[in-house]
Structure formats: C-alpha cells, structure tokens
Interface confidence: low
C-alpha cells in the first residue's frame, strides 16, 4: 500500500540499526572517495530526519521520495566538483534522471588503496572502544570498493565480523583466532561481490527478463518440489529485490528481501523441506542461509522431459500461444531435473530449445524437425563438462598457485593487450576456482566452476569496457552473458599482437620483495610471468617453467643471503640474461 512518508515507512520496517547501515552503504557506493566521517555525518542527518517523519508523517519534506532526499543530501556536499568531476553534473538533473546519472558514475575499479586489516591488538582496542563506529568503518570501506555489493548481505557480513571480534578479542592469542576467521569472511564476501555484480550486469544489459530467467533456473534446481507457479512467484520477487539493490534503492531492497524470506518460511510446505534450519535464524542470517540453502531432494517420479517438450503433438501450438510461459516451463522442468548443471548451461539449453522451435514450427513437418533437439543438447553439455575435468585435473596436479600461473599464461596469450594488473587479478581469481570447486563432489563441480568463472569474467568485461584494448575481449564481452565463458574458453593466441620489447627493468627486483607477505610475493612473480608472455606470446610451457623456476630460485637465494642488496644487484642482471636466452 502507499505510505504518506516513504522514509518513515522504511525506518519503521527496518529499525534504526539496519536503516543507518543501509544509508551508509548507499552513500559510500555513490560517492566512493568521501571519508567515513563525511558519510557518517550525512547518515546521522538522514536518520534524524527519518525520526521526525516517524513522529509526524505530515512534517515538511517527509512525503519526498527516497531518491530525492538522498540525492539532495549528496548534492549538498561541499567541493563535489573538485572531488568528483563530472559526477557533479548529475546534480543539475531532476529525479529519476539524477539517480540514473549517479548510477552511471559508480566506479567498479576505484583508485583506492587495498583495504588493509589492522593488527589484532589495535583492532580489538578500537572495536571495544566503539563497536558501532568500528562496524561503520567496515561497511564504508567495503561499500566504496564494491559499489554494487548486495547491501543486505553486507549487513550480514558486518554482523559476522562483529561476532568474530566479540569472540576473538576476549582470547589471549587474538591474532591466531582472528586471522583465519576474518580471512574466511573476506573470501566469502569477495565471491558475493562478484556474483552480485554479475546479477546487476545481467539486469543493466539485458533487462529484468534475463535476470528472471536466471532466477527460474536457479530456484528450480534448489526447489525441485515446488510447482511452476511457486517458482515463478519466487523468481518475480527475487527479481524485484535485485533490481532495487542494483538500482541503489537499498532500503526497499532490504525490506523486500526480508519480506521474501518471511514468505518462504511461511510457505515451506510448497517450497522445500530444507528450509526449517534457515527459518529458525534471526533475519540477516535467515536471508543469507536461504540464499545458499542445499537443494531439496528431487521428486522420484518425474517423467522424461521429452514427453511435454518433444513428443507432445501440441508443442508448436503451445509455444505459439504463450512463448514466455512455455519456455519458462521448459526451463523449470529441465532445471529441476539437473541440479548438476550450471545455471549458464541451463540457459544455453533453453536458448537452443527456443531457437529450434522458432525454426521448426515454421516448417512443414515440425515434429520431424524438432524431434532431435535433446540429442543436439549433447555437445553443449559436453563442453563445460570437459572444461571442468581438464581444469580440475590441472589444479590437482599444480596446486592453486601453479594453476593460477597456467591460467595467467593462457589468458595473457588470449588477450596480451590487457593491462598486466588486470590479467594478474583475473588469473588469480579464476585460479581460485580450483580450491573452491574442484574439491566438491562430482555432481556439484560443474555448477560451481562455470557459474563462478562467469562471474569473474564479468568483472574482466567491466574493467575492459572502461579502456577497451583487445578485440578478443570485446568480442566475448559483447555477446550474451551465458555465452561469455565458452567464448573466452575458445579464444586462442592473439595472432594480431606485436610482442612487447624486452625491458630489463621489468624483471629487475630489489631486496624489499623479501619482506613482502606471501600473497604480495606471488603477485610480483605473476606480474613478471605475464610480462614474459607479452614479450614471447608463443613461448612453450617448458620455456616459461624454466624461467619461473630460475626466478624462484633467485629470490630464494637472495632473500637468504647475508647481504641481500648485493645479491639482488649482482645476481639480478644474470637472471635477466638467462631469461632472455631461455626464451630466445
């Protein structure tokens, strides 16, 4: 129903703590350069205003839309043009154009330093002094670096963070309690970020219907006992929630997500037998738990998919009458039978089925034409299955770091024009798929691998869009989301690339590398590896392995030397010479 004051309505629904957290996230995602203190001041002003509207919905300005209220706040920030350049032009526009303009200026790769975690003692001190401010800093720092982070999920991660600190700061050895736990939260949050960005990309580039198709497939896999009507209702509601979050309407998004969780828990009987554990949890944990709940047991008596979609004499009639429903039903029926497929694969199959019906239903004898459609799915299914097998075998042989290096070589050959930092980031992320997915049971590997790779490649596309340099990447990023991963996999060495000339300084290292954390050392070595491939795109695996082993040996030797600086300055040039010779 309509409310006199939208801001009062959301404040009442969400409660002060979540309301303030979401407003802070919203401001941090829009204005990514502002400090925490600047945003905290705005949040307090908005919250105070919301409270006046709760007390009296007819008070001045309480009837204004949230976009108007938030936009006016952002546009009142001093020195907006100096700090944000053309984003300030958004403030000359009226709603809804102003909000659209803010959205277009969100930066997926802001030039902010990496979020450094303070050491345990310092963290615990500031957490104990003021837990609210501490968590506010966390929300601000994550949100500004990830401007499309799913806001209600970020509140969940902040809650996790809070619980870990409460527990570990009471222990004697704070460091060894905090580090693994916070690393775990960070890893999950980063995966959540790329997954949500993919959803927003789907929404932005291909509209709500594309996202809804994704949701139907995903929900049908998870809830195979729910009927099509139920799945569609859930998919529709989930689409609305994601549309709101992707569009910056974070209060509405969080409120609607809570409503959806409530609906699911009230209707477990028609959705899934696996929801009870999630439904017993408090709100943020409940919604998070539902989003990754295990698949329900598939009904035992499902008829063969061919009955309704190939053998039925009315296939073309049914398709012509209600294309969207018929294809939706196909996607639902196929997905609920295949929890072992990725959503991307299921959408490719649905697309193939649609193309087949479009072609065949226009012919003289449609059944003869579409009769082989399920057999034609085979190559589409085999391709990602082979991808998983090949890559998981390689991961098991090389381990995560070696696997990342193999991917880095492969992708640098496919798109050598892409900047080395982007290639290294992408390869490191793509390489994590091994640790994340290859250790899972066989039937869970494919969905894990392909849907994760698709999300990472979406980030590659977003970064490349800002400064397009590779025709290969442009080609793969221009197609539909579900075709991206197969397109990237099929790319080979870019023959148009003119190799980079060999620069000794690129491969010159100093003793400061010895004190870097392991992760940073790996990045330095992987940066050198990418540069080697850019110099010799057709170098063999053997040649590259020789050079990288030599490089590792060099680092090991010099970092153990009594006089590190001398070792680096004398052995470094020798290493460079050996590298050139090995690649000649």
């Amino acid at each position: 129903e309509a409310h006199k004051s939208e801001i009062a309505h959301r404040y009442n629904d969400l409660g002060e703590q979540h309301f303030k957290g979401l407003v802070l996230i919203a401001f941090s995602q829009y204005l990514q350069k502002c400090s925490y203190d600047e945003h905290a001041k705005l949040v307090q002003e908005v919250t105070d205003f919301a409270k006046t509207c709760v007390a009296d919905e007819s008070a001045a300005n309480c009837d204004k839309s949230l976009h108007t209220l938030f936009g006016d706040k952002l546009c009142a920030i001093p020195n907006l043009r100096e700090n944000y350049g053309e984003l300030a032009d958004c403030c000359t526009k009226q709603e809804p154009e102003r909000n659209e303009c803010f959205l277009q200026h969100k930066d997926d790769n802001p030039s902010l330093p990496p979020f450094e975690r303070p050491e345990a003692e310092a963290m615990c001190t500031s957490f104990k002094e003021n837990p609210t401010t501490f968590m506010g800093h966390y929300l601000h720092e994550v949100a500004r670096r990830h401007p499309y982070f799913y806001a209600p999920e970020l509140l969940y991660y902040a809650e996790q963070y809070n619980e870990i600190l409460t527990q570990c700061c009471a222990e004697a050895d704070k460091e060894s309690c905090l580090t693994p736990k916070l690393d775990g939260v960070k890893e999950k949050a980063l995966v959540s970020s790329v997954r949500q960005r993919m959803k927003c990309s789907s929404m932005q580039k291909f509209g709500e219907r594309a996202f809804k198709a994704w949701a139907v497939a995903r929900l049908s896999q998870t809830f195979p006992n729910a009927d099509f009507a139920e799945i569609t209702k859930l998919a529709t509601d989930l689409t609305k929630v994601n549309k709101e979050c992707c569009h910056g309407d974070l209060l509405e998004c969080a409120d609607d997500r809570a409503e959806l969780a409530k609906y699911m828990c009230e209707n477990q009987a028609t959705i899934s037998s696996k929801l009870q554990t999630c439904c017993d949890k408090p709100l943020l944990k409940k919604a998070h738990c539902l989003s990754e709940v295990e698949h329900d047991t598939m009904p035992a008596d499902l008829p063969a998919i061919a009955a309704d979609f190939v053998e039925d004499q009315e296939v073309c009639k049914n398709y012509a009458e209600a294309k969207d429903v018929f294809l939706g039903t196909f996607l639902y029926e196929y997905s609920r039978r295949h929890p072992d497929y990725s959503v991307s694969l299921l959408l490719r199959l649905a697309k193939k089925y649609e193309a087949t019906l479009e072609k065949c239903c226009a012919e003289a004898n449609p059944p003869a034409c579409y009769g082989t459609v399920l057999a034609e799915f085979q190559p589409l299914v085999e391709e990602p299955k082979n991808l998983v097998k090949t890559n998981c075998d390689l991961y098991e042989k090389l381990g995560e770091y070696g696997f990342q290096n193999a991917i880095l070589v492969r992708y640098t050959q496919k798109a050598p024009q892409v900047s080395t930092p982007t290639l290294v980031e992408a390869a490191r992320n793509l390489g994590r798929v091994g640790t994340k997915c290859c250790t899972l049971p066989e039937d869970q590997r494919l969905p894990c691998v392909e849907d994760y790779l698709s999300a990472i490649l979406n980030r590659v596309c977003l970064l490349h869009e800002k400064t397009p340099v590779s025709e290969h990447v442009t080609k793969c990023c221009s197609g539909s989301l579900v075709e991206r991963r197969p397109c990237f996999s099929a790319l080979t060495v870019d023959e148009t690339y003119v190799p980079k000339e060999f620069k000794a300084e690129t491969f010159t290292f100093h003793s400061d590398i010895c004190t870097l954390p392991e992760k940073e050392k790996q990045i330095k070595k992987q940066t050198a590896l990418a540069e080697l491939v850019k110099h010799k795109p057709k170098a063999t695996a053997e040649q590259l392995k020789t050079v990288m082993d030599d490089f590792a040996q060099f680092l090991d030797t010099c970092c153990k030397a009594a006089d590190k600086d001398t070792c680096f300055s004398t052995e470094g040039p020798n290493l460079v010479t050996r590298c050139k010779d090995a690649l000649a």
């Epitope: 219907r209 809804k212 099509f228 009507a229 569609t232 209702k233 998919a235 529709t236 509601d237 609305k240 009639k317 049914n318 012509a320 009458e321 209600a322 969207d324 429903v325 939706g328």
Partner: nanobody
C-alpha cells in the same frame, strides 16, 4: 488509452454464483495475458486467477481452485470469471489486469488495471 472495465459484481448468497466480465480497449487484446485479483477490506490485494494470451494456460490460487473458472474471448476483447459456490470470504473488490508477459500472475507483472467491481457474499 488503455481501459479495462469490470462488470457483473453485486450481492449474492453464500453458495451462489456470479459471472464477472472485463472488457478491454486500447490494447491488442490477444497479445496480453489477463488476470483477476481481489482485495478484501483491510487486506492486501491477492492474485486469484490468470489466463495466457491464447487461453491454453491458466493459473488458479488454491483458495478458488475447483470453484472459479477463467475464460477469454479474443474476438470480443473480453475476459470472464465464473464464480460458483461462493463463500463469505470471497467478499472483496475484484480487479481485472493485463500483462504483456505472463508467468503466473503476481501483481508486479501486470501492466494495466481496471477500477474494480465489488462482490459481496452474505451468509
């Protein structure tokens, strides 16, 4: 301008029947799925039934299955709701709605709405 005009509402005894009609104008009727929603006093609007563009697919809420029947006449640009075995809890304003795309007819998917017709079922 798109218009959906409902008619056929009124007062009826429990156990009785009514037939609601919804006449559409200003849109290509056969390109739209149609639905009936209802809103009882003090309650949220709920979906009751919907029908696909050609009439081959229907959706019924559990509360009306076996009692209500939806049909459409694309030549007449009209959708009908036959309501039998009416109960006092069926009392509500009934709204006709049109959707360019149809899945199962959640309110969010419908593009055009009528003004509603009141159905009162007395016990």
């Amino acid at each position: 301008e798109v218009q959906l005009v409902e008619s056929g509402g009124g007062l009826v005894q429990a156990g009785g029947s009514l037939r609601l009609s919804c006449a559409a104008s200003g849109l290509t009727f056969s390109s739209y799925a149609m639905g009936w929603f209802r809103q009882a006093p003090g309650k949220e609007r709920e979906r009751v039934v919907s029908i696909s563009r050609g009439g081959g697919y229907t959706y019924y809420a559990d509360s009306v299955k076996g009692r209500f029947t939806i049909s459409r006449d694309n030549a007449e640009n009209t959708v009908y709701l036959q309501m039998n075995s009416l109960k006092p809890e069926d009392t509500a304003v009934y709204y006709c709605a049109a959707a360019r795309y149809w899945a199962t007819g959640s309110e969010y998917e419908f593009d055009y709405w009528g003004q509603g017709t009141l159905v009162t079922v007395s016990s």
